[in-house]
């Protein structure tokens, strides 16, 4: 006697969510929900995210896209990957620079700035790494320099300069002055 029943949709699982009267399918990544479905378990009306916005999730029910982040030029950040409809901008540092956390307690999502890699040559040391952060990451003293304290000191150019034992060994002095 009763008419035919609508297909059952219990909103179970990730694909459906009750929006208005019915359980509706979600939108794909890169799209936002414009209008809910008009029948049980139906497709929602989804539109592509506008430029400079994105939604990375599949089967979602967001009614607006998230704004793409702008890399912080003041922090010397650059865009390693531009924003797309399905992914936010990926900010990082240009070659020859490294990421330094801006806060004292850091996790991978902490704000950061970019610092130039250390110039080991300017410290009169050999370069050991593609990007040194600290003088201890540099190598030994360059020819013509010897270890003194935490730094490299140039070999004396005449017998008037003092040349301690380590200096004598590196700089080739036969006697100490």
């Amino acid at each position: 006697q009763g008419g035919t029943r609508s297909p059952r949709c219990d909103c179970a699982g990730d694909f459906h969510k009750k929006i208005g009267l019915f359980c509706c399918r979600g939108c794909p990544a890169g799209h936002y929900l414009k209008a809910p479905c008009t029948e049980p378990c139906g497709n929602s009306t989804c539109l592509v995210c506008p430029q400079d916005t994105f939604l990375a999730w599949e089967n979602h029910h967001n009614s607006e896209c998230a704004r793409c982040q702008a890399c912080d030029e003041q922090a010397s950040q650059v865009a390693l990957e531009n924003c797309s409809a399905v992914a936010d901008t990926r900010c990082g540092c240009k070659p020859g620079w490294f990421v330094e956390c801006q806060v004292s307690q850091c996790v991978s999502s902490s704000p950061f700035y970019c610092q130039p890699c250390l110039d080991c040559g300017a410290l009169h040391r050999h370069t050991r790494l593609l990007c040194s952060r600290r003088d201890t990451d540099c190598g030994t003293c360059l020819p013509g320099f010897y270890e003194h304290g935490d730094g490299c000191v140039s070999c004396p150019t005449s017998t008037l300069g003092s040349c301690p034992e380590r200096c004598a060994a590196v700089c080739g002095w036969r006697q100490m002055f």
Epitope: R90, C101, V103, S104, C106, L129, L130, C131, R133, D150
Partner: antibody
Framework: EVQLLESGGGLVQPGGSLRLSCAAS????????MSWVRQAPGKGLEWVSA????????YYADSVMGRFTISRDTSKNTLYLQMNSLRAEDTAVYFC??????????WGQGTLVTVSS | EIVLTQSPATLSLSPGERATLSCRAS??????LAWYQQKPGQAPRLLIY???NRATGIPARFSGSGSGTDFTLTISSLEPEDFAVYYC????????FGQGTKVEIK
């Protein structure tokens, strides 16, 4: 010769605390960044925490942030890891390591932490 | 986070054979990649850093290559002491390790 010796591991109940120590010799901890890395039984390596050479910045894996605290005592040339609110998934061998440009060039032999009721 | 995927999971070879281990990154890590060796009950040991530089005291039979997302560790001729687990690690963005490759005696 560079040497690192961890201690302080043991059996602890879920929710409990432990403090791991790493005594360094052959170098000065205040001149190098230092890390803790862990390895669950039969599993791979997982970076846990690090402290900068200046000691001014500390770094944590998302899984331990807010529960673990890395620190050092330069007078004792020792690195520490204070572990609070311990969970079963924190069960692992914990290694301390000296950093070389964000790589780990010297490691201790590790100390086993078991979290179980 | 950058995910490092190592292959194969296990490599069965005989002493004297050549071993080729792979590490693939989920996004470019430039050349900021290291390889470690770990034997049972021991701490890991740094073998290669910045993709291709041998660490102090590492024999010449170990070599690393690659950049961007694909990296290789090669052991030119396996010695009995080389049978172990090998891990790659990146320092491009935070710090992550691969899941490891076990090199076992066939």
């Amino acid at each position: 010769e560079v040497q690192l010796l961890e201690s302080g591991g043991g059996l602890v109940q879920p929710g409990g605390s432990l403090r791991l120590s790493c005594a360094a010799s052959g170098f000065t901890v205040s001149r190098y960044a230092m890390s803790w890395v862990r390895q669950a039984p039969g599993k791979g390596l997982e970076w846990v925490s690090a402290i900068s050479d200046s000691g001014g910045r500390t770094y944590y894996a998302d899984s331990v942030m807010g529960r673990f605290t890395i620190s050092r005592d330069t007078s004792k040339n020792t690195l520490y890891l204070q572990m609070n609110s311990l969970r079963a998934e924190d069960t692992a061998v914990y290694f301390c390591a000296k950093e070389f440009g964000d790589y780990l060039d010297y490691w201790g032999q590790g100390t086993l932490v078991t979290v179980s009721s | 986070e950058i995910v490092l995927t190592q292959s194969p999971a296990t490599l069965s070879l005989s002493p004297g054979e050549r071993a080729t281990l792979s590490c693939r990154a989920s996004q470019s890590v430039s050349s900021y990649l290291a390889w470690y060796q770990q034997k049972p009950g021991q701490a890991p040991r740094l073998l290669i850093y910045d993709a291709s530089n041998r660490a102090t005291g590492i024999p010449a039979r170990f070599s690393g290559s690659g950049s961007g997302t694909d990296f290789t560790l090669t052991i030119s001729s396996l010695e009995p002491e080389d049978f172990a687990v090998y891990y790659c690690q990146q320092r491009s963005n935070w710090w992550t390790f691969g899941q490891g490759t076990k090199v076992e005696i066939k």
